[in-house]
Interface confidence: low
Amino acid sequence: EVEKTACPSGKKAREIDESLIFYKKWELEACVDAALLATQMDRVNAIPFTYEQLDVLKHKLDELYPQGYPESVIQHLGYLFLKMSPEDIRKWNVTSLETLKALLEVNKGHEMSPQVATLIDRFVKGRGQLDKDTLDTLTAFYPGYLCSLSPEELSSVPPSSIWAVRPQDLDTCDPRQLDVLYPKARLAFQNMNGSEYFVKIQSFLGGAPTEDLKALSQQNVSMDLATFMKLRTDAVLPLTVAEVQKLLGPHVEGLKAEERHRPVRDWILRQRQDDLDTLGLGLQGGIPNGYLVLDLSMQEALS
């Protein structure tokens, strides 16, 4: 708490300018009017205040706006944003994307801090859903942002926002998250032609069901092994050898290197060995010739 002292004669600040960097903390407290500071917040960022001086300026704003800062002030906080606590930020009502961008810019290049996480949470809740422009902005600053959301939070992402998603934004997503995102991507890209569609949908295929993989196998898409290895095991298992061959195209040869890893390993166990042999890759572990394959899941459904 800064002690209340009278402002020395002639030191009353008429505007926020560089001369204030020579003020001691108590002089800033005594001589800078909080309302003046609020209206000239945009100047603070250009002045090399010390961290101690910024503490005083924050204290003045806190006194002026005990219920939380107005957006006109928030937008121009600049480096003063780094002084805010999550508790401070929870009092804010941030609705402008420009405000969000301005504050994210301050934290650019750093890990997502609790302050930033709180800010984003406030902003998204205020908007009601993650619209395209917001998602575009957040993933530009934090590529892993999307995968930090729970499946429940992802459900509020409208299909239109999927256009903003880049492949690297999905790198750390787990299958549960892709299960939510894939149907949205399928809707978003539904009118694209085959090759363009595959380029866009590829990153989301970790959430694709079997019937969609079967459909893709008819479209000469030549899926690479890295994408195939990220597919849901339960979606890959029902695919026939012919379908996998069509799906992978020239990349089918890569199955040999992955035969001990899921989902390839589990898929091999479900195929007839003579079907696997048609690939000419030396894949082993299929069902020997002459064995009968019972689909137990179908039996359970009938019983």
Epitope: Q129, D131, K132, D133, P158, P159, S160, I162, W163, L187, A188, F189, Q190, N191, M192, E196
Partner: antibody, heavy 122, light 112 residues
Framework: QIQLVQSGPELKKPGETVKISCKAS????????MNWVKQAPGKGLKWMGW????????SYADDFKGRFAFSLETSASTAYLQINNLKNEDMATYFC???????????????WGAGTTVTVSS | DVLMTQTPLSLPVSLGDQASISCRSS???????????LEWYLQKPGQSPKLLIY???NRFSGVPDRFSGSGSGTDFTLKISRVEAEDLGFYYC?????????FGGGTKLEIK
């Protein structure tokens, strides 16, 4: 068939407000952004901005920030353009035009309304 | 903002001639999805504009094949191989990649 039907011509005095409607039919309203284009008498086309019919979020060109407002009545598949505090330079024909804003890489203004003429005269 | 400049302002032609309209942008406008959203529209007197060409060179459905679009970077061209009477009117180029989207100033195609 797919069409955009705009409200009729308006005669207003300077300082008044006008609200133009653009009713869409024959397609899913929320799958296309609604754009607004101004054409002053004897002049070219000027893009005013658009409204995302999915999220309701408007985007304005710099010359149309302030007195101009885009809005929606999604249940009626209708977009609106409101101009406040009319000035003589607002006298023009205003077109609405749909533009796909997601779901395909083919984005274009493929369906246009017939235009609404706004006359400003004291 | 991307400024679109069309030339010529007026293009007098004889029916059956080839017509060529140029559109130059102040900067390149490739969208982040890799597409260049350059479109051409025709507006006849008393009518709303009609889409002719999208994504630089793709003819919109129902547009006769005498219309063709080309170009890249900042220079784009609309060509009409054999002008017919129904082609007369004002032609506008339009970039829809970067907000604010912008139209060119227009070119009047008229009979010589």
């Amino acid at each position: 068939q797919i069409q955009l039907v705009q409200s009729g011509p308006e005669l207003k005095k300077p300082g008044e407000t006008v609200k133009i409607s653009c009713k869409a039919s024959g397609y899913t309203f929320t799958h296309y952004g609604m754009n607004w284009v101004k054409q002053a008498p004897g002049k070219g086309l000027k893009w005013m901005g658009w409204i995302n019919t999915y999220t309701g979020e408007p985007s304005y060109a710099d010359d149309f920030k302030g007195r101009f407002a885009f809005s929606l009545e999604t249940s009626a598949s209708t977009a609106y353009l409101q101009i406040n505090n009319l000035k003589n330079e607002d006298m023009a024909t205003y077109f609405c035009a749909r533009r796909r804003d997601y779901g395909t890489s083919h984005w274009y203004l493929d369906v246009w309304g017939a235009g609404t003429t706004v006359t400003v005269s004291s | 903002d991307v400024l679109m400049t069309q030339t010529p302002l007026s293009l007098p032609v004889s029916l059956g001639d080839q017509a060529s309209i140029s559109c130059r942008s102040s900067q390149s406008f490739v969208h982040s999805n890799g597409n260049t959203y350059l479109e051409w529209y025709l507006q006849k007197p008393g009518q709303s504009p009609k889409l002719l060409i999208y994504k630089v060179s793709n003819r919109f459905s129902g547009v006769p094949d005498r219309f063709s679009g080309s170009g890249s970077g900042t220079d784009f061209t609309l060509k009409i191989s054999r002008v017919e009477a129904e082609d007369l009117g004002f032609y506008y180029c339009f970039q829809g990649s970067h907000v604010p989207y912008t139209f060119g100033g227009g070119t009047k195609l008229e009979i010589k």
